[in-house]
């Protein structure tokens, strides 16, 4: 079943996907699509990489992590309720039926109306049900939400996986990771 992630209307949503290149520079094509992963390719492609660059994208979708080191996590800018649904991350490993396929469920919630700033978005206050990550500006706060049921003994090293990614400072020693490859 799909792992579920949540974001509020107007925020940026983050859908994690990683792989480990077989050797430095040995990148493989990746596609992201709206809808569950089909047998081949991605349906309704929103972003695609080749062996070197992002070579197709639609507006509001981008890779903010170090995709050339395998962090192909998708950011969706300024989400609306229509962005809810299943997304497919497909690591297109050469060879017949070698692809790694990951279905991620994005749930968009109506924006909370709050009269004044609260500690609601603070990492420690919200953990473990909600992770919030700082962006690089006031408009870029992201929510990586509703983690699958995990307990503290199961928490692994997302910060290591993210390496130079913008999330690393916030997630440090805590989080959940999808490991590919």
């Amino acid at each position: 079943s799909e792992v579920e992630y949540r974001a509020e209307v107007g925020q940026n949503a983050y859908l994690p996907c990683f792989y480990t290149p077989a050797a430095p520079g040995n990148l493989v094509p990746v596609c992201w699509g709206k809808g569950a992963c089909p047998v081949f390719e991605c349906g309704n492609v929103v972003l695609r990489t080749d062996e070197r660059d992002v070579n197709y994208w639609t507006s509001r979708y981008w890779l903010n992590g170090d995709f050339r080191k395998g962090d192909v996590s998708l950011t969706i800018e300024n989400v609306t309720l229509a962005d809810s649904g299943i997304y497919c991350c497909r690591i297109q490993i050469p060879g017949i039926m070698n692809d790694e396929k990951f279905n991620l469920k994005l749930v968009i919630k109506p924006a909370k109306v709050t009269p004044a700033p609260t500690r609601q978005r603070d990492f420690t206050a919200a953990f473990p049900r909600m992770l919030t990550t700082r962006g690089h500006g006031p408009a870029e706060t992201q929510t990586l939400g509703s983690l699958p049921d995990i307990n503290l003994t199961q928490i692994s090293t997302l910060a290591n996986e993210l390496r130079d990614s913008r999330l690393a400072n916030d997630l440090r020693d805590s989080g959940a990771t999808i490991r590919i490859g």
Partner: antibody, heavy 120, light 107 residues
């Protein structure tokens, strides 16, 4: 040391084609991409495309599809770019440049440039 | 294509000045921005890649920063030999695109 030696200046007529070369030395030719960049007089840089000598794979800027053809000769470590159906808009300096994974596919070594003048 | 808007176009400087130029991408490019120096009659030279990584042999007076859509290139103390045109480049997507350049000129 790494060197990219480009062929000399070209003066051609409108409608003609021109093929320029870029001879690489000082590194393993098949381990790096070869990118090509256009610089019109006093203007910025435009990426034309790349070729990966290891497998001959190419990628082109849509703007230059049909205008430029990239090829390599692995035996002589030489990359080529042919420009077709030339017009005055194609008058520019054309650079070959090496790019590789270590620098995130930025261009760390450049040829000296080949000047192309299209004139009747 | 992603548009890289580079400012200013010209920058009058004196030796020893601290100079800063900026590049704004039309959409997020992560950290995938490079900076090049081009002197008259020469080929461009790579100075910075992946937003802030100084290329081998580049003096530490050259620094880059930024992420997402906004990037900055700084020369902490301009030397006479730094007079040149500086270009930013996004190396996130294909086609790769460059800024229009910033020309450092003597004040």
């Amino acid at each position: 040391q790494v060197q990219l030696q480009q062929s000399g200046p070209e003066r051609v007529k409108p409608g003609d084609s021109v093929k320029m070369s870029c001879k690489a030395s000082g590194y393993t030719f098949t381990d790096y991409y070869m990118d090509w960049v256009k610089q019109s007089h006093g203007k910025s840089l435009e990426w034309i495309g790349y070729i990966y000598p290891n497998n001959g794979g190419t990628s082109y800027n849509q703007k230059f599809k049909g205008k430029a053809t990239l090829t390599v000769d692995k035996s002589s470590s030489t990359a080529y770019m042919e420009l077709h159906s030339l017009t005055s808009e194609d008058s520019a300096v054309y650079y070959c440049a090496r790019s590789g994974y270590g620098n995130y596919y930025t261009m760390d070594y450049w040829g000296q440039g080949t000047s192309v003048t299209v004139s009747a | 294509s992603i548009v890289m808007t580079q400012t200013p176009k010209f920058m009058p400087v004196s030796a020893g000045d601290r100079v800063t130029m900026t590049c704004k991408a039309s959409q997020s490019v992560g950290n995938n921005v490079a900076w090049y120096q081009q002197k008259p009659g020469q080929s461009p030279k790579l100075l910075i890649y992946y937003a802030s990584n100084r290329y081998t042999g580049v003096p530490d007076r050259f620094t880059g920063s930024g992420s997402g859509t906004d990037f900055t290139f700084t020369i902490s103390s301009v030397q006479v030999e730094d007079l040149a045109v500086y270009f930013c480049q996004q190396h996130y997507s294909s086609p790769s695109t460059f800024g229009t350049g910033t020309k450092l000129e003597i004040k």
